[in-house]
């Protein structure tokens, strides 16, 4: 039970008091009592509950006609069973005994309030009006925990605006409302108490930034809302009438959780004693709810596909029947950036992830727009976010990114248990360097602050400055599988090539050609690559690179080899030795449920086929997946990138539930 | 063959900025590596930074680092200096230079390491 | 001071050869197959001449040729002529923080 206040009894003159129903208040009965008594017994009207402890010894008795002794070890404590009809309806009688005089009374007279702050703390998508209890005071994580959730109100239902609906102090409609958590003050009063007692509603001046309170006033026409508390207003005095009362409040969050905003926003109300005009207000009473905003949650490739993002480029028109027919597969609606839109710019997935929110009452996907700000920079924010379609950013706005801070390095797994700890959610993973030094690339550290403040989805940095472009979705995916831990990690593997092209030669095809069908392109015969020394020590390098992230990813994501399917690839190092696909890099590519658009490598035709396809195919189709080979030499490979890097996809949130996860 | 136009240069003074552009003509810069390279007067050259086709990675000069950002827009097909906290030893010809990316070569060919073409230079002058 | 070191200047009569050196460390010259030299002529941009120790572009004469040993490069220009008469730069990639370096530079004077 919350605690309530402490009241002081004196025989000099009665004593007035307030006591909010649902709090333990504490009477102090000795510090006025009559110098010649040594004892005290106590009466109240039938709405009082009176507790006395005596400690040593630690006697509990009920009141009656018992007689206690006036000593410090004396707690006296009173609840009320009911909200009073008029001020002062309910009292309590001290009488002081002594051994030589008669009685001496203190009179209390007390009024009963019902105050209390409810908010959806069970995490049922309902609020139900809960007693002034301690335990809204504190938020915790997990499936037995409680705490209400917050969403960032993100997403701009007004398409005629250009802001966010967090960034204007105006509730647009009642869609505006659902992106926004209810909060209901209830009060219970005798009609007159409001005309000596006030109630103000506050927060943290640490957290008024974070958050915004909007007040619903019910007019005959509509429901309208106002701004009460705010960046601009970390407090407001409510207006509340005598009597019942339920008074609705919408709580936005207008700011993720990051480095130095935990994400717990704590919003209080608070009764004024004001009844003496010519003292300060005093307060009686404070009752809090505590919130927690909803963090930004990525979504693997193991989770259904539901939208699939492109750019139209010049002469990329095979590659976009490929992808339409890829997602008309896996029933995904798909969406098309035209060229006057992403000004030659095709790298999709380098500029945002798509994640989401969600509360219990509302989901809602948020697209996390990359600093790297190309010629795509305007989609995300023009074309994505929209109407229950959330957006974020973080980092640099102009200059001082590095390769790093696209996204095609950054990456979810799916859920793993890793020991006793589980992530129902994934790990992110992202690229970085080794070690620092002048010339290394790493993801900006406001980047990295963000994504480690969600807490959900707990990050493991990869290793992936090795590489030209420096992205993890260079070497890493993953896919859906039937059975084990319901994914495969995919890793490129220039050791399983080798030994490919090796078992190949041994079969007599070593003339076979790489690159066969490119045009401009010097076609590669099997032998000349397994005899070209250089390639091999580039490889071997890429090897190592490749296995330092292997081990990480199995001590981090708790994965056995038999979790992990070697790709078949082959590196060059390039200058300032990073290194890149020497031939379409398989592993990059786009998975919408079982089916898979994958970069044709234009390996060597051996009996009619592909042998590095084949081989992929063996690999992924025993798993139910089915494998597309998609063409994206000339328009994407050449240019550093494959078919994951020109694609993005929006995804089903879990079912799982993040509140019910302890990070 | 591409062909390369520095300018921005200019008298400046000491601590103040400048941005160098180079632009390109005859061919596409997005293939081309680019470096930035200096020429004091009268002294030897200096290679000052680097900026790789997939515009992912830079690098720069010991004598540089922290003051000079290298960047490029290919969709303007040009590469930029941004030159800032200038010294009165910067003072010198800064000459663009490039190289082209041959996705064909099966291993390293060095092509960041040289510079086959080159602009004729932009003057820089840093003087209180 | 210069990373790599050449002498500062060379000369010889039309239809000689000379050769000119650079010198560097394990870490530079000594470490990697990217050595290029440049020929400046006054008031001009440098031209690349060679590449990778001994590759030629295209358009550049077989007089000049490359070769490397050890931690040293040399630049050979046989059978001289008098537009030959310039500086020439020797440059290495290098596995220091500043990853291209240069050489002083040698003025070739033509007799």
């Known amino acids: 039970m919350a605690q309530g206040t402490l009241i002081r009894v004196t025989p000099e003159q009665p004593t007035h008091a307030v006591c909010v129903l649902g709090t333990l208040t504490q009477l102090d009965v000795c510090s006025s009592a009559p110098e010649d008594c040594t004892s005290f017994s106590v009466n109240t009207s039938p709405g009082v509950v009176v507790d006395i402890a005596h400690s040593p010894p630690a006697k509990k008795k009920s009141t009656g006609s018992s007689t206690w002794p006036l000593d410090p070890g004396v707690e006296v404590t009173l609840t009320m069973k009911a909200a009073s009809g008029s001020t002062g309806d309910q009292k309590v009688q001290i009488s002081y005994h002594g051994p030589k005089t008669p009685p001496v009374k203190a009179l209390l007279y007390l009024t009963g309030v019902e105050i209390s702050l409810s908010a959806d703390i069970t995490r049922t998508g309902k609020v139900k009006p809960t007693r002034a209890v301690e335990d809204k005071r504190t938020w915790t994580w997990g499936p037995c925990g409680q705490g209400a959730i917050l969403l960032v109100n993100c997403d701009r239902d007004n398409p005629e605006s250009s802001a966010m609906d967090c960034e204007d102090d105006e509730v647009l409609d009642s869609k505006d409302l659902k992106d926004m958590s209810l909060m209901t003050l209830s009060t219970k009063t005798p009609q007159d108490f409001f005309t000596r007692h006030t109630l103000v509603l506050h927060v943290a001046r640490s957290e008024m930034d974070k958050v915004r309170v909007f007040q619903a006033t019910r007019g005959r026409l509509s429901s309208r809302c106002r701004v009460v508390l705010g960046p601009k207003q970390p407090s407001h005095y409510l207006m509340v009438p005598g009597g019942k009362h339920n008074m609705d409040f919408y709580v936005e969050a207008l700011a993720f959780p990051d480095t130095n905003f935990p994400g717990l926003i704590t919003l209080t109300v608070s009764m004024l004693d004001t009844s003496k005009l010519e003292l300060p207000e005093a307060v009686v009473f404070q009752d809090s709810v505590v919130f927690r905003v909803a963090p930004w949650i990525m979504t693997p490739n193991t989770q259904p596909p539901q939208e699939v993002y492109v750019c139209s480029i010049f002469e990329n028109e095979d590659f976009l029947k490929s992808v339409t027919a890829l997602a008309m597969q896996a029933r995904c609606k798909l969406t098309i950036c035209p060229e006057e839109e992403n000004m030659d710019d095709q790298w999709m997935q380098d500029e945002m992830e798509i994640g989401y929110i969600q509360a219990p009452h509302k989901t809602l996907p948020v697209v996390f727009d990359s600093p790297r700000n190309r010629g795509l920079k305007e989609f995300p924010i023009k074309r994505v976010m929209g109407p229950d379609f959330g957006y974020v950013t973080r980092g640099p706005q102009t200059g001082g990114v590095s390769g790093l801070d696209s996204f095609g390095n950054l990456e979810v797994s799916p859920p793993v248990t890793v020991g006793d700890k589980e992530y129902p959610l994934g790990r992110i993973l992202f690229g970085d360097s080794c070690y620092p030094s002048s010339d290394s690339r790493e993801m900006h550290q406001a980047l990295q602050d963000f994504l480690s403040a969600q807490q959900v989805q707990a990050p493991v940095k990869l290793y992936s400055d090795w590489l030209t472009v420096g992205h993890v979705d260079e070497f890493l995916s993953f896919v859906p599988a039937p059975d084990r831990k319901g994914f495969r990690l995919l890793l490129a593997s220039p050791r399983s090539c080798y030994k490919l092209f090796q078992e190949q030669q041994n079969e007599g095809h070593g003339d076979a050609l790489l690159f066969q069908g490119i045009k401009k392109k010097n076609q590669q015969k099997i032998k000349n690559i397994l005899s070209n020394t250089t390639l091999r020590e580039h490889n071997s390098f890429v090897e190592r690179c490749i296995d330092w992230n292997r081990e990480l990813l199995k001590r981090e994501l708790g994965l056995a080899e038999s979790d992990i399917i070697d790709i078949p690839q082959l590196f060059k190092l390039k200058e300032f030795s990073k290194a890149e696909a020497f031939f379409p890099n398989m592993v990059n590519m786009l998975v919408l449920g079982k089916h898979l658009g994958i970069p044709k490598p234009f390996g060597p035709i051996i009996n009619g086929r592909c042998c590095l396809e084949e081989k992929v195919c063996s690999l992924l189709e025993p798993l139910g997946l089915h494998c597309t080979f998609i063409n994206d030499f000339y328009t994407y490979h050449i240019r550093h990138g494959e078919v994951h890097c020109g694609t993005n996809v929006r995804r089903k949130p879990f079912s799982f539930k993040w509140w019910n996860m302890v990070p | 063959q591409v062909q390369l136009v520095e300018s921005g240069g200019g008298l400046v003074k000491p601590g103040g900025s400048l941005r160098l552009s180079c632009a390109a003509s005859g061919s596409t810069l997005s293939d081309y590596f680019v470096s930035w390279i200096r020429q004091a007067p009268g002294k030897g050259l200096e290679w000052v930074s680097f900026i790789n086709t997939a515009n992912t990675f830079t690098y720069y000069a010991d004598s540089v680092r922290g003051r000079f950002t290298i960047s490029r827009d290919n969709a303007k097909n040009s590469v930029y200096l941004q030159m800032n906290s200038l010294r009165a030893e910067d003072t010198a010809v800064y000459y663009c230079?490039?190289?082209?990316?041959?996705?064909?070569?099966?291993?390293?060919?060095?092509?960041?390491?040289?510079?086959?073409?080159w602009g004729r230079g932009t003057l820089v002058t840093v003087s209180s | 001071q210069s990373a790599l070191t050449q002498p500062r200047s060379v000369s010889g009569s039309p239809g000689q050869s000379v050769t000119i050196s650079c010198t560097g460390t394990?870490?530079?010259?000594?470490?990697?197959?990217?050595v290029s030299w440049y020929q400046q002529h006054p008031g001009k941009a440098p031209k690349l001449i060679i590449y990778?120790?001994?590759e030629r572009p295209s358009g550049v004469p077989d007089r000049f040729s490359g070769s490397k040993s050890g931690n040293t490069a040399s630049l050979t220009i046989s059978g001289l002529q008098a537009e030959d008469e310039a500086d020439y730069y020797c440059s290495s990639h290098s596995r220091s923080s500043t990853p291209v370096l240069f050489g002083g530079g040698t003025k070739l004077t033509v007799l």
């Open positions: 990778n120790v001994y």
């Open positions: 394990s870490g530079d010259v000594g470490r990697y197959s990217h």
């Open positions: 230079s490039s190289a082209n990316d041959d996705v064909d070569d099966i291993v390293a060919p060095g092509r960041g390491y040289y510079m086959d073409v």
